[in-house]
Interface confidence: medium
Amino acid sequence: APRGTQAEESPFVGNPGNITGARGLTGTLRCQLQVQGEPPEVHWLRDGQILELADSTQTQVPLGEDEQDDWIVVSQLRITSLQLSDTGQYQCLVFLGHQTFVSQPGYVGLEGLPYFLEEPEDRTVAANTPFNLSCQAQGPPEPVDLLWLQDAVPLATAPGHGPQRSLHVPGLNKTSSFSCEAHNAKGVTTSRTATITVLPQQPRNLHLVSRQPTELEVAWTPGLSGIYPLTHCTLQAVLSDDGMGIQAGEPDPPEEPLTSQASVPPHQLRLGSLHPHTPYHIRVACTSSQGPSSWTHWLPVETPEGVPLGPPENISATRNGSQAFVHWQEPRAPLQGTLLGYRLAYQGQDTPEVLMDIGLRQEVTLELQGDGSVSNLTVCVAAYTAAGDGPWSLPVPLEAWRPGQAQPVHQLVKEPSTPAFSWPWW
């Protein structure tokens, strides 16, 4: 017969039946054919496509003594644990010479209690904040109607009357449970129960109240927490490394943050033991019995500069005639800011104090007034930052210069500027 048609009589004497059942069902489809000569391999088709991995068995029974006599061939296709993907039209197929024969079709259908494709999931939500829950079920048979329940109480008068696939909850003030029921002609299936835990809302308006070189006082406005009072708030501070790049909503900073807990109220906390003149990022979260809120975004803050905590070190002052050479080293104590320079004061026993701003140099040559006969001349030095002067050094007496002692040439200060303010002399 031309073109692989079934012009010759079909060899099939038994065709697949129909199977309709619930998910998980196990069933068998069977077809039978009678052929002359060598029995062919029977292939199974679903929706016109050969099943490559079919769980099929083939039995062949000769009807005579001779190889060329007729054979009865029976093929059985086993369907284990029926799923939606198994449904469709089934046929047997054989190749006989250059011809292709297919059996009459049988059908596999699915019918039973609704099956959930999606169920509500446990989640946490901020108090009084809207959220959605999802539930999706299918038959067959269709239609499948959903009924949502909150704390075991139906949210609609009947299945299919309320929200279906998505439930919009405008907000909760207490931890609640949600589930959905799927109804079809075969009955009802109930989904898992999802617990929705109500956490405090994220605090708002985190801001600085006051700043000291080594401490910051911060305050914030708590968010709503439903029926659960806040137990405490947690504040984190982290050094703002230049390379850290903490942005709003970015992942946590790489180093371990400084963490402090605040009893509430008041919604305020003094953060101590900080570095002066240092940028930090801070954030806050508040906790109830149900758990913590989300963190606020990182807020950039900075401790102010302080004054140096100690005087310059190793001050030496030597005198040679009408000139005095003074030099010193940077304070060993913390500067608490950016060093802007040094102030120097000198005074004789019966002469007024002379005050000078030296800048960042650590040495100076003074041109003394008069013939150099001023007695008991002493010098004091203090370092200063933008926040002000640090402590003055103890007075250092001017020592007479001894021959052989090195004395580098320095810029002479002939006319020290008169300060606009006076400095106490110890």
Epitope: G48, E52, G88, Q89, P105
Partner: antibody, heavy 118, light 112 residues
């Protein structure tokens, strides 16, 4: 005797859509895949997609996913291809082809010549 | 997706000569279940629908002259015309032929 009947010509304006038909006879319509093939003038053959009338299962060539929609009407044993947002690029001969199992022989319709012109 | 490559794209021969044309697929067309290669060869004459010549890589369609022979398995296939006739002037296409189809670009046969 297997037959696939297609209208000879269709003339439509750019931007419009068209529904090409393919009426099957001489076999059990729900048992065999119907394929659609495009051939532009002087060009080769391009497979568009196919549909199995028994279950409405269908497959598409990625290139035609947003252009062609395949449907069947079992009661009249007719397969349809809906082509949308037509342009001159869609002017071609469109064949419907019945696919036999396992890559064995197939049957071709005579083709519909679609002309998209204003 | 399976890609089908045909060569040559065209060839011109005199009547009576033997012709071979090649079709390569990007993956094997041999179905392990049915042990058949899902490859078909078509002939399309000017103004006509494609006509099936060979299916299952080597099975000649009923009514097709014996001078047309298909061979090959897996990824490499050949169509041979043992003695070309004037009426063989056409474009020849190979096709991966199971469920999702892919056609080769065609080989145009001209008679000198």
């Amino acid at each position: 005797q297997v037959q696939l009947q297609q209208p000879g010509t269709e003339l439509v304006k750019p931007g419009a859509s068209v529904k090409l038909s393919c009426k099957a006879s001489g076999y059990i319509f729900t048992n065999f895949w119907i394929n659609w093939v495009k051939q532009r003038p002087g060009q080769g053959l391009e497979w568009i997609g196919n549909i199995f009338p028994g279950s409405n299962s269908s497959n598409y060539n990625e290139k035609f996913k947003n252009k062609a929609t395949l449907t069947v009407d079992k009661s009249s044993s007719t397969a349809y291809m809906h082509l949308s947002s037509l342009t001159s690029e869609d002017s071609a001969v469109y064949y419907c082809v019945r696919d036999y199992y396992g890559g064995s022989p197939d049957y071709w319709g005579q083709g519909t010549t679609l002309t998209v012109s204003s | 997706d399976i890609v089908m490559s045909q060569s040559p794209s065209s060839l011109a021969v005199s009547a009576g000569e033997k012709v071979t044309m090649s079709c390569k697929s990007s993956q094997s067309l041999l179905n392990s279940k049915t042990r058949k290669n899902y490859l078909a060869w078509y002939q399309q004459k000017p103004g006509q629908s494609p006509k099936l010549l060979i299916y299952w890589a080597s099975t000649r369609e009923s009514g097709v002259p014996a001078r047309f022979t298909g061979s090959g398995s897996g990824t490499d296939f050949t169509l041979t015309i043992s003695s070309v006739q004037a009426e063989d002037l056409a474009i020849y296409y190979c096709k991966h032929s199971y469920n999702l189809w892919t056609f080769g670009g065609g080989t145009k046969l001209e008679i000198r």
